[in-house]
């Protein structure tokens, strides 16, 4: 699996979307859960409704969300106030019996709030790019670009 | 196996800039982030900041907000810290490292270290 | 910024004695808390990451505890290799910020 960078400003919320074939994954409950470690196990966050017929259902742990539409085969998580702690690997998952498939593996990056108080749209932003694949990416803690500084592209 | 080799040792003048680079090898240097991290003799660690290899955003410790600047060279796989202004009490080992993965921001992964002296 | 004190700043131990040392954080960090080994000339070394969860490769005489804002690093059977410096971090907020050290000598 490719991991896919979103980036977040601390304090505000992100929105991680992670793709799906509905067909596939018919009848399935979701969960979202965070990668301890480089080789450790991925320990569950927040799943979706436990009747599979009402995975529309915004169901949250703590400050985390998880929302699914099966017919659009798109699982969406919201972290809401997002912190520097935040910041990791994490995966989208599909849930049959005990197993579990990977449908995403995501990395979410933490910038820090902007020194000079300037609004979230005015940093620049590369909304969700594919890292290479098979990575194991480290949680990003960041700040935003200062005036002039101008970053170079995603690699993708 | 992963690598961090790190640039030769550097001696400074007050008021110079100095740029020490961290070379990576063994793994794909996009998928981990390069923290910056330096120890005074004799004196404890100091985290001085963070950049993303996968689009150079960074993040800096108050204290060197302006003096500091993280950037990376893909093409080389290449981390650089330049630190300008140097003044004596700059002079330390620095380090790279890269980051676990996991969401804790701990490193197992470090570069041998580069001593900067600054000294007139 | 989040302070950390560690304690003590040193002590003397025999090989096959059990070692403790204490990591306090001036604020909640949960458990993102990770310790370090440092011997002289060398780079740091991690030994547990998440305030509990041993690194790959490091002897399994070496445990971390805590969450909240006290944190405990515990050597069960000092070994030789073992006289070095010993550091907690946090990260979980910015900045990542370290304890003073803990430097482990032979007594």
């Known amino acids: 699996h490719n991991t896919t960078v979103f980036q977040g400003v601390a304090g505000q919320s992100l929105q991680v979307s992670c793709p799906y074939d509905s067909m596939k994954h018919w009848g399935r409950r979701k969960a979202w859960c965070r990668q301890l470690g480089e080789k450790g196990p991925c320990q569950r966050v927040v799943s979706t409704h436990n009747l599979w017929l009402l995975s529309f259902l915004r169901r949250w742990n703590g400050s985390t969300a998880i929302t699914d539409d099966t017919l659009g085969g798109t699982l969406t998580i919201t972290l809401r106030n997002l912190q520097p702690h935040d910041a990791g690997l994490y995966q989208c998952q599909s849930l049959h019996g005990s197993e579990a498939d990977t449908l995403r593996k995501v990395l979410v990056e933490v910038l820090a709030d902007p020194l000079d108080h300037r609004d979230a749209g005015d940093l620049w932003f590369p909304g969700e790019s594919e890292s290479f694949e098979d990575a194991h990416v480290e949680h990003s803690i960041s700040r935003s670009l200062l005036e002039g500084e101008i970053p170079f592209p995603p690699t993708s | 196996q992963v690598q961090l080799v790190q640039s030769g040792a550097e001696v400074k003048k007050p008021g110079a800039s100095v740029k020490v680079s961290c070379k990576a090898s063994g793994y794909t240097f996009t998928s981990y982030g390069i923290s910056w991290v330096r120890q005074a003799p004799g004196q404890g660690l100091e985290w001085m900041g963070w950049?993303?290899?996968?689009?150079?955003?960074?993040n800096y410790a108050q204290k060197l907000q302006g003096r500091v600047t993280m950037t990376t060279d893909t093409s080389t796989s290449t981390a650089y810290m330049e630190l300008r202004s140097l003044r004596s009490d700059d002079t330390a080992v620095y380090y790279c490292?890269?980051?676990?993965?996991?969401?804790?921001?701990?490193?197992?992964?470090w570069g041998q270290g580069t001593l900067v002296t600054v000294s007139s | 910024d989040i302070q950390m004190t560690q304690s003590p700043s040193s002590l003397s131990a025999s090989v096959g004695d059990r070692v403790t040392i204490t990591c306090r954080a001036s604020?909640?960090?949960?458990?993102?808390l990770n310790w370090y080994q440092q011997k002289p000339g060398k780079a740091p070394k991690l030994l547990i990451y998440?305030?509990?969860s041993l690194q790959s490769g490091v002897p399994s005489r070496f445990s971390g505890s805590g969450s909240g804002t006290d944190f405990t690093l515990t050597i069960s059977s000092l070994q030789p290799e073992d006289f070095a410096t010993y550091y907690c971090?946090?990260?979980?907020?910015?900045?990542?910020?370290f304890g003073g050290g803990t430097k482990v000598e032979i007594k």
């Open positions: 998440a305030a509990s």
């Open positions: 490292a890269r980051g676990s993965g996991s969401g804790y921001d701990s490193w197992y992964d």
């Open positions: 950049i993303s290899t996968y689009n150079g955003n960074t």
């Open positions: 971090q946090q990260s979980y907020d910015f900045p990542i910020t």
């Open positions: 604020q909640s960090i949960s458990s993102y």
